[in-house]
């Protein structure tokens, strides 16, 4: 190889200067005695190279780019060779930003997958390869003192969430959890969460059903619906409160909310509705009075209220 480029730093803050030098060895005998070294950034020739002959007879050109405004570009040094440009060497330059502090870290305990799922907002684009790692440890107290550290959780490329499997969790013991972001320009860490996995549990919703009319029970009044719900069995022993929402199927009406309902109400008469009207209903629940996350809304149940009896 006749030429070699070295740079002050191959990765810099976007807009920062960068200095590069290109040396052509003397033993490239097919060259002119004083070849002129040219610089090119991407497709553009760059003026301002300062060239000198070194004591060993090789030629060196040094250039300072005052502002690297490309997030990714190739810098090459070249010679005029006949009517064409002969590239001697090139390097890839990258520019971007250090990672911002990851924001809005939150976690939920999924009892179906037996894992603690944490998600966060990575912040603005850095234009550089940036790795995110979910870090955690067990703590007997309020996370001021660190207990056993838990294996790092590394999300899949481009994802801003990660799952800590059950084998690393103690359901009723505090964990310190934070996200570390790292790239060539720096490292940042989110504020630390301190939580018990069960305090961020997200349950599956109950299954809404229409209540089978029993022979001895009075039929529902006009504008009323008789409902029942089947709790999600794996969460049967968790104290919960629930809420119901309903809206007429036709028209643009918004959801009306009814609650709180105890999970174990199991049977419920919903009144004050329009007679002879088809309604869509859903239910959701949350661990209560202990902390937790609301479940998703249940699949919809569609029911029709009875008509008003003729007067």
């Amino acid at each position: 190889e006749c030429g070699h480029i070295s740079v002050s730093a191959p990765i810099v803050h976007l807009g920062d200067p960068i200095t590069a030098s290109c040396i052509i060895k003397q033993n490239c005998s097919h060259l002119d005695l004083e070849p002129q070294i040219l610089w090119r950034l991407g497709a553009e020739l760059q003026p301002g190279g300062r060239q000198q002959r070194l004591s060993d007879g090789s030629q060196q050109s040094t250039i300072t780019l005052p502002h690297l405004n490309h997030t990714r570009a190739f810098l090459s040094c070249a010679l005029n060779w006949g009517n064409s440009l002969q590239i001697l060497d090139q390097v890839e330059l990258r520019a971007g930003y250090p990672p911002a502090v990851p924001r809005n870290l939150s976690c939920l305990m999924n009892l179906t997958t037996s894992s603690l799922i944490c998600q966060w907002e990575p912040g603005p684009e850095t234009h550089l390869p940036t790795s995110f790692t979910l870090k955690s440890f067990k703590s007997r107290g309020n996370c001021q003192t660190q207990g056993d550290s838990i294996m790092d959780c590394v999300p899949e490329d481009g994802q801003s969430h990660c799952s800590i499997p059950r084998r690393h969790l103690l359901l009723y013991q505090n964990m310190g959890i934070w996200v570390q972001a790292e790239n060539a320009l720096g490292t940042s860490m989110s504020p630390q969460l301190c939580l018990e996995p069960m305090d961020v549990v997200k349950l599956e919703p109950p299954m809404l059903r229409t209540m089978d009319p029993s022979p001895e029970a009075a039929p529902p009044q006009a504008g009323c619906l008789q409902l029942s719900w089947e709790p999600w069995q794996p969460a049967l022993h968790i104290n919960q409160k629930c809420e119901l929402r309903h809206k007429p199927q036709s028209g643009e009406a918004s959801w009306a909310l009814v609650g709180p309902l105890p999970l174990e109400a199991l049977r419920y008469e919903l009144c004050g509705l329009l007679p002879a009207t088809a309604y869509t209903l859903q239910i959701r629940c949350i661990r209560w009075p202990l902390p937790g996350h609301w479940s998703n809304w249940s699949p919809s149940l569609e029911l029709r209220t009875t008509e008003r009896a003729p007067t």
Epitope: L171, P231, L236, H237
Partner: antibody, heavy 118, light 107 residues
């Protein structure tokens, strides 16, 4: 310290009735599911019934459904099991236990022996 | 109903041995598996809940693993006080069901 103390066991004839009680102390009784588990002599454990914190949900094992009734009095911190139409196969030590949020039993009472025999 | 099958039903072991007891569910129960120790004439005592969570006050030589249908209780180094009967229990759905028990006796 959480304590559960069963009482009411004894010898009863087939077809007879018995009411077991479990007095709870050391925790907020009204916040927890409670349950009964039995163990026939030399056999394994068998879940009998559970009751939700306010008493609204009461699942039963098929083997006792329609004969046994679980109930609770949160003002007295006491769990009950009313056993009617008793059979020889109901002979067992009956334990009352607190139910954890994901369905485990802890702690347990010391047990009370129910013997159904003529 | 979910059936729980425990194996072996009995085993002989010596102090210091590593002991493994398995429990199989007739259908998937996620991690809803609990382990108990029972000594003669005494009430059962909870060792492990939710497949791998060690109950407070239980020595760390006890550990649980598995998910779905296959679960294991391991005693890393058997101590004299560990000779007892061990029961598994599923809490995924009612009726709550127990395995038949494993009696760990002195060889």
């Amino acid at each position: 310290e959480v304590q559960l103390l069963e009482s009411g066991g004894g010898l009863v004839q087939p077809g007879g009735s018995l009411r077991l009680s479990c007095a709870a102390s050391g925790f907020t009784f009204s916040l927890y599911w409670m349950g009964w588990v039995r163990q026939a002599p030399g056999k394994g454990l068998e879940w009998v019934s559970s009751i939700s914190s306010s008493g609204g949900v009461t699942p039963y094992a098929d083997s006792v459904k329609g004969r046994f009734t679980i109930s609770r009095d949160n003002s007295k911190n006491t769990l009950y099991l009313q056993m009617n139409s008793l059979r020889a196969e109901d002979t067992a030590v009956y334990y009352c236990a607190m139910l954890g949020e994901l369905g485990w039993f802890d702690p347990w009472g010391q047990g009370t022996l129910v013997t159904v025999s003529s | 109903d979910i059936q729980m099958t425990q194996s072996p039903s009995a085993l002989s072991a010596s102090v210091g041995d590593r002991v493994t007891i398995t429990c199989r569910a007739s259908q998937g129960i996620s991690s809803y598996l609990n382990w108990y120790q029972q000594k003669p004439g005494k009430a059962p005592k909870l060792l492990i809940y939710y497949a791998s969570n060690l109950q407070n006050g239980i020595p760390s030589r006890f550990s649980g693993s598995g998910s779905g249908t296959d679960f294991t209780l391991t005693i890393s180094s058997l101590q004299p006080e560990d000779f007892a009967t061990y029961h598994c229990q599923q809490s995924y759905s009612t009726p709550l069901t127990f395995g038949g028990g494993t009696n760990v006796e002195i060889r």
